[in-house]
């Protein structure tokens, strides 16, 4: 008797659902006394299906609403758990275990990734020296670096500081504030770069006519 | 901290049953993970013989299959190993163990007991 | 059953020297490896798992490589504690099986 995966490693986002899926041998009709499928993440136990009952008593709390078998797939050897929401926490090695005559169990991988997407920006000036500061925030997951780059997408000078805080979901809170000699119209931009394909966020900063704060804008590409 | 403990006869005769029974401290044996036993033969050959899941499920050594059953007295938070028809290819020093939290390998070990099969 | 090959079976050093101990699977078990080591009437201990994830509590000179079919284990500058059993675990397919271990000795 032996399980298998598909996939052993799902890279998922933040808040979104991922299924995950063991395969196992039904031979003609499944018999649903005969099955007990197990899922669970470390010492959290998060499906306990046994001959065709789920008990819920014993999920762990971090799971409860959020994680199910999908039983429709039983009968075609496949024990998928769908977790809804997903959170950063659910990052981990899973495992299902399963007996059906015999017994086995594979290992999952699940990262989670929390892209920096949804940039706030603003722009200040110091009246005596016309410095520009200029600051974008977003919240993400795992560290991202801040790049700020000019109208030629080349790196600026100026005095620069991040700091980086965590949210209730335990996201990363990074603010970056870059200081400048700027004039109105020039533009800039602050990039959340991570080292993997396709998790770069920009935001383009333009420097407004007039000296003043002006409230955060959410303009991203 | 996890802490195993094996106990049993250290010695057996031949075509008799081995028992042991492995005691486990600061972790409920029905709270997670597989629970294992190990043996190490004379010379140092190291064989996986067997598990039982928190939940109850074994997984055996095909090569003691018809010979091996693992068991659990939660009440006790113990596992036990029984081996029968057991000869003296059967001596060795025999080891439980608990799995590491992501599962494969053997994070926790008792001392290990020698069990001697001998007329 | 995957059969896990060790070599050397027996490596002697000087405390200080550098060493290399080799495990190979029979088939490919892609980085389902662990490393132990047993020191004389004790239990062995994880060192590595997962082929190069080293392991709290275990000193930095310790370290795996490897992926498939050949492992290594490496200890860099070896230390008088060190000296005792090596095993090798692999944890593909079951039954899980462990290398026959290779005995490092004090030259």
């Known amino acids: 008797f032996t399980v298998t995966v598909p996939k052993d490693l799902y890279v998922v986002e933040y808040g979104s659902n991922m299924t995950i899926e063991c395969k196992f041998p039904v031979e003609k009709q499944l018999d649903l006394a005969a099955l007990i499928v197990y899922w669970e993440m470390e010492d959290k136990n998060i499906i306990q299906f046994v001959h065709g009952e789920e008990d819920l008593k014993v999920q762990h709390s971090s799971y409860r609403q959020r994680a199910r078998l999908l039983k429709d797939q039983l009968s075609l050897g496949n024990a998928a758990l769908q977790i809804t929401d997903v959170k950063l926490q659910d990052a981990g090695v899973y495992r299902c275990m399963i007996s059906y005559g015999g017994a086995d169990y594979k290992r999952i991988t699940v990262k989670v990734n929390a892209p920096y997407r949804k940039i706030n920006q603003r722009i200040s000036v110091d009246p005596a020296t016309s410095e520009h500061e200029l600051i974008c925030q977003a919240e993400g997951y795992p560290e991202a670096e801040v790049i700020w780059t000019n109208s030629d997408h080349q790196p600026v000078s100026g005095k620069r500081s991040v700091t980086t805080s965590r949210t209730e979901g335990m996201l990363l809170n990074v603010t970056s504030s870059l200081r400048v000699n700027a004039t109105a119209n020039d533009v800039f931009y602050c990039t959340f770069w991570r080292s993997q394909p396709g998790q770069n966020h920009t935001a383009e900063l333009i420097i407004p006519e007039l000296p003043a704060t002006h409230p955060p804008q959410n303009r991203t590409h | 901290d996890v802490q195993l403990q094996e106990s049993g006869p250290d010695l057996v005769k031949p075509s008799q049953t081995l028992s042991l029974t492995c005691t486990v401290t600061?972790?409920?044996?029905?709270?997670?993970?597989?629970w294992h036993w190990i043996r190490q033969f004379p010379g140092n050959k190291l064989e996986w013989m067997g598990y039982?899941?928190?939940?109850?499920?074994?997984n055996y050594n095909p090569s003691l299959k018809s010979r091996i059953s693992i068991t659990r007295d939660t009440s006790k938070n113990q596992f036990f190993l029984q081996l029968s028809s057991v000869t003296t290819e059967d001596t060795a020093t025999f080891y439980c163990?608990?799995?590491?939290?992501?599962?494969?390998?053997?994070?926790?070990w008792g001392q290990g007991t020698l069990v001697t099969v001998s007329a | 059953d995957i059969v896990l090959a060790q070599s050397p079976a027996t490596l002697s050093v000087t405390p200080g020297d550098s060493v290399s101990l080799s495990c190979r699977a029979s088939?490919?078990?892609?980085?389902?490896l662990h490393w132990y080591q047993q020191k004389s009437h004790e239990s062995p201990r994880l060192l590595i798992k997962?082929?190069?994830q080293s392991i709290s509590g275990i000193p930095s000179r310790f370290s795996g490589s490897g992926s498939g079919t050949d492992f290594t284990l490496s200890i860099n500058s070896v230390e008088t504690e060190d000296f005792g059993m090596y095993f090798c675990?692999?944890?593909?397919?079951?039954?899980?099986?462990f290398g026959s271990g290779t005995r490092l000795e004090i030259k």
């Open positions: 163990a608990r799995e590491g939290y992501d599962y494969d390998w053997f994070a926790y």
């Open positions: 088939q490919s078990i892609s980085n389902n």
């Open positions: 675990q692999q944890s593909k397919s079951w039954p899980f099986t």
């Open positions: 600061g972790y409920s044996i029905t709270s997670g993970y597989n």
């Open positions: 039982i899941h928190h939940s109850s499920i074994t």
């Open positions: 997962y082929a190069s």
